[in-house]
């Protein structure tokens, strides 16, 4: 059976600045094309690594036990995780070198729960989004972003941390998910695949997109990331899918044009400040939201994920640059840096718009299978 056709006004149709086309039926895999949880990828399918908020700008996270090792926040995923693996297994490996920092990779040993027990939690990210099952929540208002249009100076740090490319954001970028739900942006990073292989973290009805951007935020209720980890709503991530379009995306080009300078793992450069909001879809009113986790160790839960319905368009050349320029650990290309989708375990994904509406003529009254939870509580 084919997946339902996505119309202009239906989930993930239409893109930033009206440049992208809605996803048509031909863009979506049939059921047999969809990745199967029971079919983990081979070794070559395993993505690289990943990391979280602000790196050395952030305080240490104290390890739960000796076995975990000293987990510093710079070792955390920028709210990201492993590849097309098909089990909720998250494996990490400890690098013998280095200064007692935890290093892990997708698909290696030891299993992630040994690095951080939270990785075996019940409410992990990323997840597969099924719009038909999303609960329409009229209480979910358009996102509000303030101060995201940065001037060229001061410059920002762009770093290849071995598992993603991360842009550290300056103070002053404020985001509100709704009244009383205020956050400050810390950093953004990307997830991608490899040639001909998509690499988004979240999926939509099993469809994986070429890439995904994450903008990581700290709740204003907390002064430090380590205080917020594991607390409900302590961290919030804005996520958007990146798709191929006919034109170069000038906002992304400001970052992608600099990747050659940081091809080597651990290298960094400075880039002019830019309009961070231009990296996101233009429609801040239509999104999916759920509570999940960081997508790499320490896999802390309580993270509010907001996944835009609208996608962002990059040219084929830009997507190739993203997936084919950077190098990760051990002389391997930094590719497929995404985590397998995790089970919802009863969680309900909310939508700020009626995502479950079937646009075909015979659909009279849409059936909403899930009811909206009290948003903003």
């Amino acid at each position: 059976q084919r997946l339902p056709r996505m119309q202009e006004d239906s989930p993930l149709g239409g893109g930033s600045s009206g440049e992208d086309d809605p996803l048509g039926e031909e863009d979506l895999p049939s059921e047999e094309d969809s990745p199967r949880e029971e079919d983990p990828p081979g070794e070559e399918d395993l993505p690289g690594e990943e990391d979280l908020p602000g790196e050395e700008d952030l305080p240490e996270v104290k390890p739960k036990s000796e076995e975990e090792g000293s987990l510093k926040l710079e070792d955390l995923p920028t709210v990201e995780a492993p590849g097309d693996p098909q089990e909720p297994q998250n494996n990490a490996h400890r690098d013998k070198e280095g200064d007692d920092q935890s290093h892990w990779r997708y698909g290696g040993d030891p299993p992630w729960p040994r690095v951080s027990p939270a990785c075996a939690g019940r409410f992990q990210s990323p997840v597969d989004i099924r719009p038909q099952l999303a609960a329409f929540c009229p209480a979910l208002r358009p996102l509000e972003l303030l101060g995201f249009q940065l001037p060229p100076l001061p410059e920002l740090r762009l770093r290849n941390n071995g598992h993603s490319v991360q842009l550290t954001l300056p103070p002053g970028l404020e985001m509100a998910l709704g009244p009383g739900r205020e956050y400050r942006a810390l950093q953004l990073h990307l997830h991608w695949g490899a040639a001909g292989r998509p690499g988004s973290e979240h999926t939509v009805e099993g469809h994986r997109f070429p890439a995904e951007i994450h903008v990581v935020h700290l709740s204003t209720a907390f002064a430090r990331v380590d205080e917020a980890l594991g607390r409900p709503g302590g961290l919030a991530v804005l996520a958007a899918f990146l798709e191929e379009g006919p034109e170069e995306n000038s906002a992304y080009e400001q970052l992608l044009s600099r990747l050659e300078e940081i091809a080597e793992e651990g290298s960094e450069t400075q880039v002019p400040g830019l309009d961070i909001s231009a990296l996101l879809p233009s429609d801040f009113s239509r999104y999916f939201q759920y509570e999940g986790s960081l997508t790499t160790p320490p896999c802390a839960q309580g993270v509010i994920w907001t996944v835009f319905n609208q996608t962002v368009m990059l040219s084929a050349k830009q997507l190739h640059t993203l997936s084919d320029t950077l190098w990760g650990p051990g002389d391997s290309r930094l590719q497929l840096n995404f985590r397998a989708t995790q089970p919802l375990n009863g969680r309900v994904i909310e939508a700020s718009f009626p995502a479950g509406v079937d646009s075909s003529p015979r659909a009279a009254e849409p059936v909403q299978l899930n009811s909206c939870l009290a948003a903003g509580d």
């Epitope: 249009q149 001037p151 060229p152 001061p154 400075q270 002019p272 309009d275």
Partner: antibody
Framework: EVQLVESGGGLVQPGGSLRLSCAAS????????MHWVRQAPGRGLEWVAF??????????QYSASVKGRFTISRDNAENSLYLQMNSLRAEDTAVYYC???????????????WGKGTTVTVSS | DIQMTQSPSSLSASVGDRVTITCHVS??????LSWYQQKPGEAPKLLIY???NLHTGVPSRFSGSGSGTDFTLTISSLQPEDFATYYC?????????FGQGTKLEIK
């Protein structure tokens, strides 16, 4: 008085090298990004390179046309800016200006103080 | 790279005239644009920064406007010392680029 004075220009053969210097005075040199901008005879202005200020680690940035051939550096104790030019080509012939632009309080790059320039001629 | 296109390339005007020079940019640069004046044998001088801010010591007859991709430099009443070449420059991202220049000549 804020001042920039270039020196070191001259005639050089293709493939040769030259080192330009710029003496800065009248301002806190380490606070500023410093640039080289050139102008070929009868042509427009072309940005060549800059070196960041103290707050940004004094790292360099180059235009594609000179990357790998030119090296920008600064001596903060001497309030001096340099441009080492190697593998010179005929198309590098220009007046080279030392320019101040961008500091801790700036929000973008504009060039507010220019030296008088020094002429580099690359010819056999 | 960001492309800058000035128009006109040259312009003849008389003392007292109001003159407008435009600068079109290939992509949105917000207000990160500057204007410079250059006289023969001299270095350029900054006139306007951030699209509309007058640099210290520049006469008030000079003004700048615009944002995004289209910018304008206006001289409200031309003076003899204003005959020169004018350049726009984007400071949004490197490589920093300049317009090709507009030569303002006496009619």
């Amino acid at each position: 008085e804020v001042q920039l004075v270039e020196s070191g220009g001259g005639l050089v053969q293709p493939g040769g090298s030259l080192r330009l210097s710029c003496a800065a005075s009248g301002f806190t040199f380490t606070d500023y990004y410093m640039h080289w901008v050139r102008q070929a005879p009868g042509r427009g202005l072309e940005w060549v390179a800059f070196i960041r200020n103290k707050a940004s680690g004094y790292t360099p940035q180059y235009s594609a046309s000179v990357k790998g051939r030119f090296t920008i550096s600064r001596d903060n104790a001497e309030n001096s800016l340099y441009l080492q030019m190697n593998s010179l080509r005929a198309e590098d012939t220009a007046v080279y200006y030392c320019v101040r632009g961008g500091h801790a309080g700036s929000n973008y790059w504009y060039f507010d103080v220019w030296g008088k320039g020094t002429t580099v001629t690359v010819s056999s | 790279d960001i492309q800058m296109t000035q128009s006109p390339s040259s312009l003849s005007a008389s003392v007292g005239d109001r003159v407008t020079i435009t600068c079109h940019v290939s992509q949105n640069i917000n207000v990160w644009l500057s204007w410079y004046q250059q006289k023969p044998g001299e270095a350029p001088k900054l006139l306007i920064y951030q699209a509309s801010n007058l640099h210290t010591g520049v006469p008030s007859r000079f003004s700048g406007s615009g944002s995004g991709t289209d910018f304008t430099l206006t001289i409200s009443s031309l003076q003899p010392e204003d005959f020169a070449t004018y350049y726009c420059q984007q400071g949004q991202s490197y490589p920093f680029t300049f317009g090709q220049g507009t030569k303002l000549e006496i009619k």
